[in-house]
């Protein structure tokens, strides 16, 4: 069985998570993309793009915005006004149909904590960019630049760019892609 290694990201309530998922291969350009959360062992689709995807045509579902750039092989995910209950495991996926998706990225373990007033972390303006590139193995690929597994939110008005992993993957074998059932 294949297990994905997650990366942990810590935020305060009210902040914004921004994730960029890099899917690169042309065969996925016109596929629907989705942002899912693991609930127990079952993934739940929170938002998915339209089909066919259009460049810079955002899809908004509540506090989640998906923006697909099929001509550049990028999916941008934004979750605003984070709440403690948003904590959990998230993934970008290529959405095939309700029962199956292709997971292309190591999961993000989001930890949202209560922000105490007056602390730097409680600013709603503070955004952390997380860059995802395809993973073809169960093990997380080591980052090109040394960075901790746990990333704590930066002070307001600043952006921390976390790039994991450092090099792009040559997806020559479709069996490298992990398939998981999806129930929504």
């Amino acid at each position: 069985t294949t297990e994905l290694t997650e990366e942990k990201y810590e935020y305060k309530e009210g902040q914004t998570l921004e994730v960029k998922c890099d899917y690169a291969l042309e065969k996925y350009a016109n596929s629907r993309k989705a942002w899912q959360k693991m609930e127990g062992k079952m993934p739940k689709i929170l938002a998915k793009t339209e089909r066919p995807s259009e460049n810079s045509h955002p899809v908004q579902v509540g506090r989640i915005t998906l923006e697909d750039y099929p001509d550049h092989g990028l999916l941008q995910v934004q979750m605003t006004n984070l709440q403690v209950e948003d904590s959990g495991l998230y993934q970008c996926v290529i959405y095939q149909h309700p029962k199956e998706s292709h997971v292309l990225f190591n999961p993000i373990c989001l930890v949202v904590t209560k922000g105490s007033s007056g602390t730097p972390g409680s600013s709603e303006n503070s955004t952390q960019n997380v860059y995802r590139t395809p993973s073809t193995t169960a093990k997380a690929l080591g980052p090109r630049y040394t960075s901790p597994r746990t990333v704590t939110q930066a002070p307001p008005e600043s952006t921390v760019v976390v790039s994991t992993p450092g090099s792009e993957i040559n997806l020559t074998n479709v069996t490298d892609i992990i398939r998981v059932p999806v129930f929504n």
Epitope: K20, A24, E26, H72, L74, T172, N173
Partner: antibody, heavy 121, light 111 residues
Framework: EVQLVESGGGLVQPGGSLKLSCAAS????????MHWVRQASGKGLEWVGR??????????YYAASVKGRFTISRDDSKNTAYLQMNSLKTEDTAVYYC????????????WGQGTLVTVSS | DIVLTQSPDSLAVSLGERATINCRAS??????????LHWYQQKPGQPPKLLIY???NLESGVPDRFSGSGSGTDFTLTISSLQAEDVAVYYC?????????FGQGTKLEIK
């Protein structure tokens, strides 16, 4: 190991035609866009054009300097990309490289050794 | 078309010293905060070799004395400590828009 091997270069007269081939191995050819880049002797690199994959309807894109004269095609069953060059001009004289990117609009990670095309009377 | 202008055209640096090459784009080569700007090294009689992709990512197998930075329209390739084998021509290239374009090249020599 990814390998790209160009062939078909040679001497041709102005106004003539030539077809270059790029034989690919070591990867799933049908998955990637293929590009042609050229370099005149002692000059810089010039992107010639690219052909996308079947999922992108084999769309092609060209530099303005070759548009209407050059045609890029591919045969996924033969793992080969082609560059058909018509109405050749002396300024088309160059080494022609076949390259493979790392995905949509990604970098050129793999290059062939190049084939020399000389357009002269 | 996006025009990439490299500076300087040629550069002579002493062994062990830092070499810096700049690349300026006529318009932004960024999409969704990704810079589609890459750096290549070419030695005589050889095809180009990828050094840096998407502005700052070191290609596998490339020595870490090479680094890239920048976003939008202004980019820099830096060699922290020049080695004899770094003598070559260096090119920037953008893939954000068709047609893809290269800079005119920068020739790096040893002083």
């Amino acid at each position: 190991e990814v390998q790209l091997v160009e062939s078909g270069g040679g001497l041709v007269q102005p106004g003539g035609s030539l077809k270059l081939s790029c034989a690919a191995s070591g990867f799933t050819f049908s998955t990637y866009a293929m590009h042609w880049v050229r370099q005149a002797s002692g000059k810089g690199l010039e992107w010639v054009g690219r052909i996308r994959t079947k999922s992108s309807n084999y769309a092609t894109y060209y530099a303005a300097s070759v548009k209407g004269r050059f045609t890029i095609s591919r045969d996924d069953s033969k793992n080969t990309a082609y560059l058909q060059m018509n109405s050749l001009k002396t300024e088309d004289t160059a080494v022609y490289y076949c390259t493979r990117d790392m995905g949509i609009r990604r970098q050129f990670a793999y290059w062939g050794q190049g084939t020399l095309v000389t357009v002269s009377s | 078309d996006i025009v990439l202008t490299q500076s300087p055209d040629s550069l002579a640096v002493s062994l062990g010293e830092r070499a810096t090459i700049n690349c300026r784009a006529s318009e932004s080569v960024d999409t969704a905060d990704y810079s589609f700007l890459h750096w290549y090294q070419q030695k005589p009689g050889q095809p180009p070799k990828l050094l840096i992709y998407r502005a700052s990512n070191l290609e596998s197998g490339v020595p870490d004395r090479f680094s890239g930075s920048g976003s939008g329209t202004d980019f820099t390739l830096t060699i922290s400590s020049l080695q004899a084998e770094d003598v070559a021509v260096y090119y920037c290239q953008q893939s954000n828009e068709d047609p893809y374009t290269f800079g005119q090249g920068t020739k790096l020599e040893i002083k």
